[in-house]
């Protein structure tokens, strides 16, 4: 059947009323107010409706739920817990809904949830147990295989007095619940570093997107255990050079494709190993587009066209010869 709007008609100030009305037991094929439903497509869309909370009367058949462009602010524990449970819900998109807090157990009682998109929400407070649901050292495995967390960094003045990277990683690692995660997108989050333990504990990853962050170095990051990794997006970061250990780990991954465009590569003597590697490796996509940013004399030179004579470091003068 074609998508049907709810019979009720609300103005943009109606979310409170909608939630009050929905306290009654839901009808079998009921569609929440301000939403569009298609039972044939098993899809519910409550998009750009300024909802302040998750509708309570979601139909049990829902497999794909879009709650984008709303004003949810807080996702409490059991935000999607229903009786009977939403046993079919597989894909949940909450992007751009002004969420600033996701509490422990927010996604509990969703046994089929495979895809979750929280992108474009200023998550100042992401509970370590948002995805694991409990504070046990080893939680029940989450069914999530795809977690999209692009641009969830809050404005600087809204951040807690703790590392944003640390907060996100704590949620990813809690209870080892995300061992089955295959796709993780963390683009556009101003990450300065990647905590060294995060990748080792996500062994099933196939796709990792860290593009458009502020990563300066991968020296302490290990990719060795990510034997299933197919794509690694590192475009638009602040990478200066990749060192031998990283090159060897990437080269050894059986399925990998690496994306390195638009990083400020420093073409001095420390770049020699990476240039040698680039000339022979087939794992870097679009490697002919990689160019130097520094030093000034090397700007815009193509990395693949450099030779060892081009890659020098200014000698370090002894203190007695240095000028102030």
């Amino acid at each position: 059947s074609s998508p049907t709007s709810s019979a009720s008609s609300f103005s943009s100030s109606a979310p409170f009323l909608a939630s009050a009305v929905s306290a009654q037991p839901p009808l079998p094929d009921q569609c929440p107010a301000l939403c569009e439903c298609s039972e044939a497509a098993r899809t519910v869309k409550c998009v750009n409706r300024n909802l302040t909370e998750v509708p309570t009367d979601l139909p049990a058949y829902v497999r794909n739920l879009f709650l984008t462009g709303n004003q949810l602010a807080v996702l409490p524990a059991g935000a999607f817990a229903r009786r009977p449970p939403l046993a079919e819900l597989a894909a949940l998109n909450l992007s751009g809904s002004r969420l600033d807090e996701v509490r422990a157990g927010a996604f509990e009682h969703l046994p089929s949830l495979r895809q979750l998109d929280l992108s474009h929400n200023p998550l100042a407070d992401l509970s370590p147990f948002a995805f694991s649901g409990s504070n046990a050292s080893v939680s029940a495995p989450s069914p999530l295989v795809e977690l999209i967390l692009n641009h969830i960094v809050p404005p600087e003045d809204e951040r807690q007095n703790r590392s944003f990277e640390g907060m996100v990683v704590a949620a990813l690692l809690a209870g080892r619940a995300l061992q089955g995660l295959r796709r993780l997108e963390l683009a556009s989050n101003h990450f300065l570093y990647l905590p060294r333990d995060v990748l080792a504990q996500l062994p099933s990853l196939r796709h990792l997107d860290l593009s458009n962050n502020s990563l300066v170095s991968l020296t302490y990051v290990s990719f060795r255990n990510l034997t299933h990794l197919e794509s690694l997006h590192l475009e638009d970061n602040a990478l200066k050079v990749l060192h031998n250990g990283t090159l060897a780990e990437l080269q050894g991954l059986p399925h990998i494709r690496v994306f390195l465009d638009n990083n400020p590569w420093v073409c001095d003597c420390h770049m020699a190993d990476m240039v040698t590697w680039l000339k022979e490796t087939e794992v870097v996509q679009g490697k002919d587009r990689l160019t130097c940013a520094y030093p000034e004399k090397m700007r815009n030179r193509v990395l693949l066209e450099l030779n060892s004579a081009d890659l020098d470091c200014d000698p370090i003068l002894p203190p007695s010869l240095q000028t102030s």
Partner: antibody, heavy 122, light 111 residues
């Protein structure tokens, strides 16, 4: 399930041309390097060449024995790989296999087609 | 081009017994810590199937009686207990450098 199905083989005279096709399914075709490998009757395997993926501009590499005569191409809209063979010689007689490279192409081919026989004879 | 030399050319085997095939490269096939050397089995009338990649990684779905070892220029494929279905021609292949090259093959047959 990954599948590769070759076609286009047959009997051709020396100096003639032939185009082999390989229809691919079960994977994202544009992500992968694709190759041709041949095997003369009763002989070993010989790498003919490969074509790179979208990320690396679909550029090609060929073995010296076929350079200038054979061209590898792909139609990504049809998920099909081609081998255009010109100026064929008797020594090009072989079963031609289409194969997919692993995601990291340094690890070579993980899936092969069933092969198509090309016979060059007058 | 890198030349791969396999030995023996022919290997008669007894089911249940172990078997071993050697592959020697004319130069190192190692690149940044990984040896890019594969082993394939071509059963009679079939196309080649991948057994081992990167010298020692067993391809998914391949029985664990197959193992690969070696680095640099010297490599070995071992079958811990040969089964009747293992007969065919075994090829090593290097993908360290273009052109990729294959060994001449080792024919494994039941005694």
């Amino acid at each position: 399930e990954v599948q590769l199905v070759e076609s286009g083989g047959g009997l051709v005279q020396p100096g003639g041309s032939l185009r082999l096709s390989c229809a691919a399914s079960g994977f994202t075709f544009t992500d992968y390097y694709m190759s041709w490998v041949r095997q003369a009757p009763g002989k070993g395997l010989e790498w003919v060449g490969f074509i790179r993926n979208k990320g690396n501009g679909y550029t090609t590499e060929n073995s010296a024995s076929v350079k200038g005569r054979f061209t590898i191409s792909r139609d990504n809209s049809k998920s099909t790989l081609y081998l255009q063979m010109n100026s064929l010689r008797a020594e090009d007689t072989a079963v031609y296999y289409c194969a997919r490279y692993r995601g990291n192409p340094h690890y070579a081919m993980d899936y092969w087609g069933q092969g198509t026989l090309v016979t060059v004879s007058s | 081009d890198i030349v791969l030399t396999q030995s023996p050319l022919s290997l008669p085997v007894t089911p249940g017994e172990p078997a071993s095939i050697s592959c020697r490269a004319s130069e190192s096939v190692e690149f940044y810590g990984t040896s890019f050397l594969q082993w394939y089995l071509q059963k009679p009338g079939q196309s080649p199937q991948l057994l081992i990649y990167g010298a020692s990684n067993v391809e998914s779905g391949v029985p664990d009686r197959f193992s690969g070892s070696g680095s640099g220029t010297d490599f070995t494929l071992k079958i811990s207990r040969v089964e009747a279905e293992d007969i065919g021609v075994y090829f090593c292949q290097q993908s360290r450098k273009v052109p990729s090259t294959f060994g001449g093959g080792t024919k494994v047959e039941i005694k």
